[in-house]
């Protein structure tokens, strides 16, 4: 902690400007008024203050705000953010998504810190929601950031918000994050016909259940195959090959080179042979003609 | 073996209402989408609707669009037409059939509605 | 809509005959095209789809041909039980469309 010492006679700030580089830390502790600096937060972004510098002006906030600092003053904060705790950030009541961007682009380019992830925390809580305008500056900054959410987080995420999200956004997510994330997706884009719907979707289609996968395969979509490996296999494995077929359209040829990954491995294995001979493709696995195919489901609806 | 059986038909006045039935056996039903197609007294065929293996889905023709809803029961093994608003251009036999991806692979026999004062 | 459309609509052929029906679609339906054949009161029954892959249990003389808009269906030697009116489908694009049927006759 800085001894308190009285300011020498002259020092006395009047306003933050840079002559208040060449104070010594100590000067600063005695010479700079806390409610002065509050006020006028927004130039010390513009003045090269060094770490220790900012260490002391910290210091002096935390003393005026011992409860968190005002809105005020914490869209201004500029780098001095960098200097928070997230036990700092914790105090704090962060409603504005000006105050999110600007804390933001400080962080622009690093990883997401625990600073930053307190603070879109602290945002989303005092919001409510992960509102569609929050989704789009966040993943703006952060493309990962909706695949940091649990399933639970994800859930808050109206449906509305899921035209900010772009592919890249979801590069990340496990299949129980898209589980979470398909529904809202389909429900947001259900007004749209079926080559925009699908362009739209297709991120989200690791989560679609089987029944989806069956009507997508109605609309001439023509599924690539990195899309198709990245559906849920046990989502695949009820597909007939006629609706593989359709749903792939011209890139049903891919699926030779995909045969020993899932889920097309798993998928072959569920299919008559002499059925996938009807592709011409050589897949090999199938169930051999003359078998009978059990529905053990049924049999213990039946037992 | 795949069995499809239709019931329901009969004679019924212009603007009237109906309900086909049609009993799936022989296969897992609720891993299929179905469908239904008409065919007038020497006409060739046409299709009516289909729906998804679970249901959620629902396709038709302009032509039917808005008077026959096509639905299904899974614990009953049952697709379903209602047909209401009919008219006499909807006299026909109408056949259930199973639909897989872009082919109707198996159908029933039939069942003959006509539509008539 | 996607408009099928079949010829001849009728034809006259003895056993053994060779017999071509042909069914052209209003645009592209690349090879979603599906074949059938019905007998008097009887359903409909699929013999080929894809174009020309054999539905189980269709005897090999019946084979498909064709891409895009024009489609072909071949009975190489026509037997008894074939006299039929035969229906062509595209399954490419909603609503699933049928041509109008081609009736073989016994010459």
């Known amino acids: 902690e800085v001894e308190k010492t009285a300011c020498p006679s002259g020092k006395k700030a009047r306003e933050i400007d840079e002559s208040l580089i060449f104070y010594k830390k100590w000067e600063l502790e005695a010479c700079v008024d806390a409610a002065l600096l509050a006020t006028q937060m927004d130039r010390v972004n513009a003045i090269p203050f060094t770490y220790e510098q900012l260490d002391v002006l910290k210091h002096k906030l935390d003393e005026l705000y011992p409860q968190g600092y005002p809105e005020s003053v914490i869209q201004h904060l500029g780098y001095l953010f960098l200097k928070m705790s997230p036990e700092d950030i914790r105090k704090w009541n962060v409603t504005s998504l000006e105050t999110l961007k600007a804390l933001l682009e400080v962080n622009k380019g690093h990883e997401m810190s625990p600073q930053v992830a307190t603070l879109i925390d602290r945002f989303v809580k005092g919001r409510g929601q992960l509102d569609k305008d929050t989704l789009d500056t966040l993943t703006a900054f952060y493309p990962g950031y909706l695949c940091s959410l649990s399933p639970e987080e994800l859930s808050s995420v109206p449906p509305s918000s899921i035209w900010a999200v772009r592919p890249q956004d979801l590069d990340t997510c496990d299949p129980r994050q898209l589980d979470v994330l398909y529904p809202k997706a389909r429900l947001a884009f259900q007004n749209m016909n079926g080559s925009e719907y699908f362009v739209k979707i297709q991120s989200f289609l690791g989560g679609a259940p089987t029944e989806d996968l069956k009507a997508l395969s109605q609309q001439n979509v023509s599924m690539d195959l990195a899309t198709f490996m990245k559906l849920r296999t046990d989502a695949v494995l009820p597909l007939t090959v006629a609706e593989v077929q359709k749903l792939l359209g011209p890139h049903v040829e891919g699926l030779k080179a995909e045969e020993r990954h899932r889920p097309v491995r798993d998928w072959i294995l569920r299919q008559r042979q002499d059925d996938l001979d009807t592709l011409g493709l050589g897949l090999q696995g199938g169930i051999p003609n003359g078998y009978l195919v059990l529905d053990l489901s049924m049999q213990e609806a039946l037992s | 073996e795949v069995q499809l059986v239709e019931s329901g038909g009969g004679l019924v006045q212009p603007g009237g209402s109906l309900r086909l039935s049609c009993a799936a056996s022989?296969?897992?039903?609720?891993?299929?989408?179905m469908s239904w197609v008409r065919q007038a007294p020497g006409k060739g065929l046409e299709w009516v609707a289909t729906?998804?293996?679970?249901?959620?889905?629902?396709y038709y023709p302009d032509s039917v669009k808005g008077r026959f809803t096509i639905s299904r029961d899974n614990s009953k093994n049952t697709l379903y037409l209602q047909m209401n608003s009919l008219r006499a251009e909807d006299t026909a036999v109408y056949y259930c059939?199973?639909?897989?991806?872009?082919?109707?692979?198996?159908w029933g026999q039939g069942t003959l509605v006509t539509v008539s004062s | 809509d996607i408009q099928m459309t079949q010829s001849p609509s009728s034809l006259s052929a003895s056993v053994g005959d060779r017999v071509t029906i042909t069914c052209r679609a209003s645009?592209?339906?690349?090879?979603?095209l599906n074949w059938y054949q019905q007998k008097p009161g009887k359903a409909p029954k699929l013999l080929i789809y894809?174009?020309?892959r054999l539905h189980s249990g269709v005897p090999s003389r019946f084979s498909g041909s064709g891409s895009g808009t024009d489609f072909t269906l071949t009975i190489s030697s026509l037997q008894p039980e074939d006299f039929a009116t035969y229906y062509c489908?595209?399954?490419?694009?909603?609503?699933?469309?049928f041509g109008q049927g081609t009736k073989v006759e016994i010459k």
């Open positions: 894809y174009t020309s």
């Open positions: 729906i998804s293996n679970g249901g959620t889905y629902t």
């Open positions: 059939a199973r639909f897989d991806g872009y082919i109707f692979d198996y």
């Open positions: 489908q595209q399954g490419n694009t909603l609503p699933w469309t």
């Open positions: 022989g296969y897992t039903f609720s891993d299929y989408f």
């Open positions: 645009q592209d339906i690349s090879n979603y």
